[in-house]
């Protein structure tokens, strides 16, 4: 950089680069100002005048410092199986996520392609593995001494209460019934709820113009096939 602070536009030193929040304009052959998030380049710089920025119009955005001629369009309204967790603003795209009780059954680079309802374990079965943002609940039969009497995507098998005198023995789908007035629980406390999974963020990525080639994109996938769960049901 020159010894004194250079004001845009300026010609970079031979072999030098432009500063942060500046870009090299090939036509003007000058370092020029980028526009801040929420704005775009209305007029590109010349040798004598800097970039002129303007605010993004409604339903458009820029998330990064940029020199795009037009702001990016916000994504479509969320599908009815999704909820909007981030509104479209001038600085951020709309974010859609699978609604509560659902998970992303098919992820794509653009976000969640298909949301599916979380499996519910029927009575006699409890949650072995809770649902995540990209995987379904896995149910397992309640082991001897435990039960689940609910149809739920969060309830695990709970231990039968221990009776001084048993009126009705417990089974996989029903707690023991005691004649005693003060039954006790074996080990674990009563109802245990697993937390609902955090929904997948479905966000459209914003391309940014650059003098060099853009880096490759990548996205996360769920790990490995999971076996189908027994004892599952729907609503």
């Amino acid at each position: 950089l020159p010894a004194q602070v250079a004001f845009t536009p300026y010609a970079p030193e031979p072999g030098g680069t432009c500063r942060l929040r500046e870009y090299y304009d090939q036509t003007a052959q000058m370092c020029c100002s980028k526009c801040p998030p929420g704005q775009h380049a209305k007029v590109f710089c010349t040798k004598t005048s800097d970039t002129v920025c303007d605010s993004c119009e409604d339903s458009t955005y820029t998330q990064l410092w940029n020199w795009v001629p037009e702001c990016l369009s916000c994504g479509s309204r969320c599908s009815s199986d999704q909820v909007e967790t981030q509104a479209c603003t001038r600085e951020q795209n709309r974010i859609c996520t699978c609604r509560p009780g659902w998970y992303c059954a098919l992820s794509k680079q653009e976000g969640c392609r298909l949301c599916a309802q979380l499996r519910k374990c029927r009575p006699g079965f409890g949650v072995a593995r809770p649902g995540t943002e990209t995987s379904d609940v896995v149910c397992k039969p309640c082991a001897p001494g435990t039960f689940s009497n609910t149809t739920s995507s969060t309830d695990i098998c709970r231990p039968h209460q221990i009776c001084h005198v048993v009126a009705i023995p417990g089974n996989a789908s029903m707690d023991a019934v005691c004649t005693s007035t003060s039954p006790t629980r074996s080990m674990a406390p009563g109802a245990v709820h697993l937390p609902q999974p955090v929904s997948t963020r479905s966000q459209h990525t914003q391309p940014t113009p650059a003098p060099s080639t853009a880096p490759g994109t990548s996205f996360l996938l769920p790990v490995g096939p999971s076996p189908p769960a027994e004892g599952s049901t729907g609503d």
């Epitope: 479509s76 059954a105 098919l106 976000g111 949301c115 599916a116 995987s135 769920p222 096939p225």
Partner: antibody, heavy 124, light 112 residues
């Protein structure tokens, strides 16, 4: 070429179960999903459910989800659909079809490849 | 669930004449990714269904250009510019925008 080959016709008594197979070839099985569709005699198409061949994630039609299980065997590139507690109104031709999956980066085509169909007859 | 309806349910046509099938969905089929996952399938007698059109208007490979799709949101149309004998069969619209996937009841196209 890309194809789905289904198992042969089945006859079952009410209350029994049936398991239909759908063997894929000509493409990377785990890059796609498999959808199952059935068609009762003289009727339209009914969507039964879907399985992501990569993750094993499934989603079933609500009226069938207590009786149906869809699975895949990635080692043999085969999808399976098991239907339990069969009733006479389950008599139909059952089709598997390829659908987009986690690894299908090209343009979305929809159900672009279909099996030849498996006739399941439920009769006492 | 998204309900798909089709009109007409039966369409007797003259060879060489155009045919048009309408499909309507009970709610918008525009996905949050911007795509509209509306397909048209053809099922000839005794055969499995065959994909004709995907994402409203894209002809699948090998499908003759006499087939075209149009529409947006909740209203869609399949047109056959000049019906040929091999076009006899039942035509279904279907949505794969969200679960559960749903089909229209089908439109039977036959020759007068």
């Amino acid at each position: 070429q890309v194809q789905l080959v289904q198992s042969g016709a089945e006859v079952r008594k009410p209350g029994a179960s049936v398991k239909v197979s759908c063997k894929a070839s000509g493409y990377t099985f785990t890059s796609y999903s498999v959808t199952w569709v059935r068609q009762a005699p003289g009727q339209g198409l009914e969507w039964m459910g879907w399985i992501n061949a990569f993750s094993g994630n499934t989603h079933y039609a609500q009226n069938l989800q207590d009786r149906v299980t869809m699975t895949t065997d990635t080692s043999t590139s085969t999808a399976y659909m098991e239907l339990r507690s069969l009733r006479s109104d389950d008599t139909a031709v059952y089709y598997c079809a390829r659908e987009e999956g986690s690894g299908s980066y090209e343009d979305y085509y929809g159900m672009d490849v279909w099996g030849q169909g498996t006739t399941v007859t439920v009769s006492s | 669930d998204i309900v798909m309806t089709q009109t007409p349910l039966s369409s007797p046509v003259t060879l060489g004449q155009p045919a048009s099938i309408s499909c309507r969905s009970s709610q918008s089929l525009v996905h949050s990714d911007g795509n509209t996952y509306l397909s048209w399938l053809q099922q000839r007698p005794g055969q499995p269904p065959r994909l004709l059109i995907y994402k409203i208007s894209n002809r699948f490979s090998g499908v003759p250009d006499r087939f075209s799709g149009s529409g947006a949101g909740t209203d869609f149309t399949l047109k056959i510019s000049r019906v040929e004998a091999e076009d006899v069969g039942v035509y279904y619209c279907m949505q794969t925008t969200q679960f559960p996937f749903t089909f229209g009841p089908g439109t039977k196209v036959d020759i007068k």
